[in-house]
């Protein structure tokens, strides 16, 4: 029988070089063998490019479209083919569907006695428009204390967060992860960065003093 698209492709752009399109088929599909997503910039003399999708679960497919860079006027036509059968036709304006790249290199610095310093890297180069527009959310939680989970919103440009060590329990491990969004581009949140684990060994001065005399 003929193949059918159950859930039409939806695409997001990283506003740099890649747009990711996901969709669901009506039944189990070998996406890379059976399907092709053709995309073409609607502009003078632009050629059609082919994306070979990958499986994303039994009926899901995902395709990573290379787009060099993106400007606000860019618009792409999308054609999903199964051999000679056109399954779906649509269009996609990357600037209107932006999902930033995830921040990287999340590091926890505990060498400052009373502060936990978290730093991470902006996922964009300085010449990208999103570079100076990203704000972040840092999620800190503890596997030892399941009740503890906090989100810290970082609304300034510098990719750092300082937390007083005294606000965390001593003698247990914590994890942190960070994600980004760009307010002026009305983006969705990025994926979370890989998490980083650290051990909070900080003790209050009076607690140390008390400990010392007993």
């Amino acid at each position: 029988g003929s193949m059918k698209v159950l859930q039409e492709p939806t695409c997001v752009s990283d506003y740099m070089s890649i747009s990711t399109c996901e969709w669901k088929m009506g039944g189990p599909t070998n996406c890379s063998a059976e399907l092709r997503l053709l995309y073409q910039l609607v502009f003078q003399s632009s050629e059609t490019h082919t994306c070979v999708p990958e499986n994303n679960g039994g009926v899901g497919c995902v395709c990573h479209l290379l787009m060099d860079d993106v400007v606000s006027m860019d618009n792409y036509t999308l054609d999903l083919w199964a051999g000679q059968q056109l399954l779906w036709k649509g269009s996609f304006k990357p600037s209107e569907h932006v999902k930033p790249r995830a921040p990287g290199n999340l590091t926890v610095h505990t060498n400052v006695s009373d502060t936990v310093l978290l730093t991470w890297s902006n996922p964009y180069p300085p010449d990208n428009y999103l570079y100076n527009d990203l704000t972040y959310a840092v999620n800190i939680w503890s596997e030892n204390d399941p009740a503890y989970s906090r989100i810290h919103n970082v609304t300034y440009l510098k990719p750092t967060l300082r937390i007083p060590a005294s606000t965390l329990k001593s003698g247990i491990s914590y994890r942190a992860r960070v994600r980004a969004w760009a307010q002026h581009y009305n983006t969705t949140w990025s994926e979370w960065s890989p998490s980083t684990k650290w051990y909070n060994s900080y003790r209050e001065p009076f607690e140390q003093h008390h400990h010392h005399h007993h």
Partner: antibody
Framework: EVQLVESGGGLVKPGGSLRLSCAAS????????MSWVRQAPGKGLEWVST????????NYADSVKGRFTISRDNVKNTLYLQMNSLRAEDTAVYYC????????????WGQGTLVTVSS | DIQMTQSPSSLSASVGDRVTITCQAS??????LNWYQQKPGKAPKLLIY???RLHSGVPSRFSGSGSGTDYTLTISSLQPEDFATYFC?????????FGGGTKVEIK
């Protein structure tokens, strides 16, 4: 690092022919439109021709249409400009340039090759 | 063809000066306006594309603005290496066309 190296320039008589080449490296050549831009001695810049990433589309300035042919070899990562029926006014430094996705700007340029048309 | 009129054709300025160059298109070019820098005997270099986007590796003292038919290149604080000729170019419609150039000289 993107590198574009032109060759094939030289002195040619009016009515003669010349073939310019541009060897590209440092990027996926087959993904980008490529162009030729020229500059007559002491003058401004003039767009000559553009070819799409796969070679399906070619566009020319009116001043060279019917005389010049742009082509590319995506296996050899090389851009060409075949110039026939050359005129004195074609004398210029010819630059090959790489576009972005839109082929609206010339993002990277070669060092240029001088073509002199004179009897 | 779209005509690109650049002004001034030349200007003299000192290191540290703020310099502005304008480019007017004969019709709306929908922000597809690019700026190049060229030094004698060298190939042009792309500075700004799509009106205001800084090309990779270009110092932030260069900026672009404009819309419709009128566009501007600004150098916020002129440096010794900025003395050169600057060209605008429209990419909205074939044939692609350049402005006549602006030569920035040392005062």
């Amino acid at each position: 690092e993107v590198q574009l190296v032109e060759s094939g320039g030289g002195l040619v008589k009016p009515g003669g022919s010349l073939r310019l080449s541009c060897a590209a490296s440092g990027f996926t050549f087959s993904r980008y439109a490529m162009s030729w831009v020229r500059q007559a001695p002491g003058k401004g810049l003039e767009w000559v021709s553009t070819i799409s990433s796969g070679g399906s589309y070619t566009n020319y300035a009116d001043s060279v249409k019917g005389r010049f042919t742009i082509s590319r070899d995506n296996v050899k990562n090389t851009l060409y400009l075949q110039m026939n029926s050359l005129r004195a006014e074609d004398t210029a430094v010819y630059y090959c340039a790489r576009a972005t996705a839109r082929a609206t700007e010339f993002a990277y340029w070669g060092q240029g090759t001088l073509v002199t048309v004179s009897s | 063809d779209i005509q690109m009129t650049q002004s001034p054709s030349s200007l003299s300025a000192s290191v540290g000066d703020r310099v502005t160059i304008t480019c007017q298109a004969s019709q709306d070019i929908s922000n597809y306006l690019n700026w190049y820098q060229q030094k004698p005997g060298k190939a042009p270099k792309l500075l700004i594309y799509y009106t205001s986007r800084l090309h990779s590796g270009v110092p932030s003292r260069f900026s672009g603005s404009g819309s419709g038919t009128d566009y501007t290149l600004t150098i916020s604080s002129l440096q010794p290496e900025d003395f050169a000729t600057y060209f605008c170019q429209q990419g909205n419609t074939l044939p692609l066309t350049f402005g006549g150039g602006t030569k920035v000289e040392i005062k």
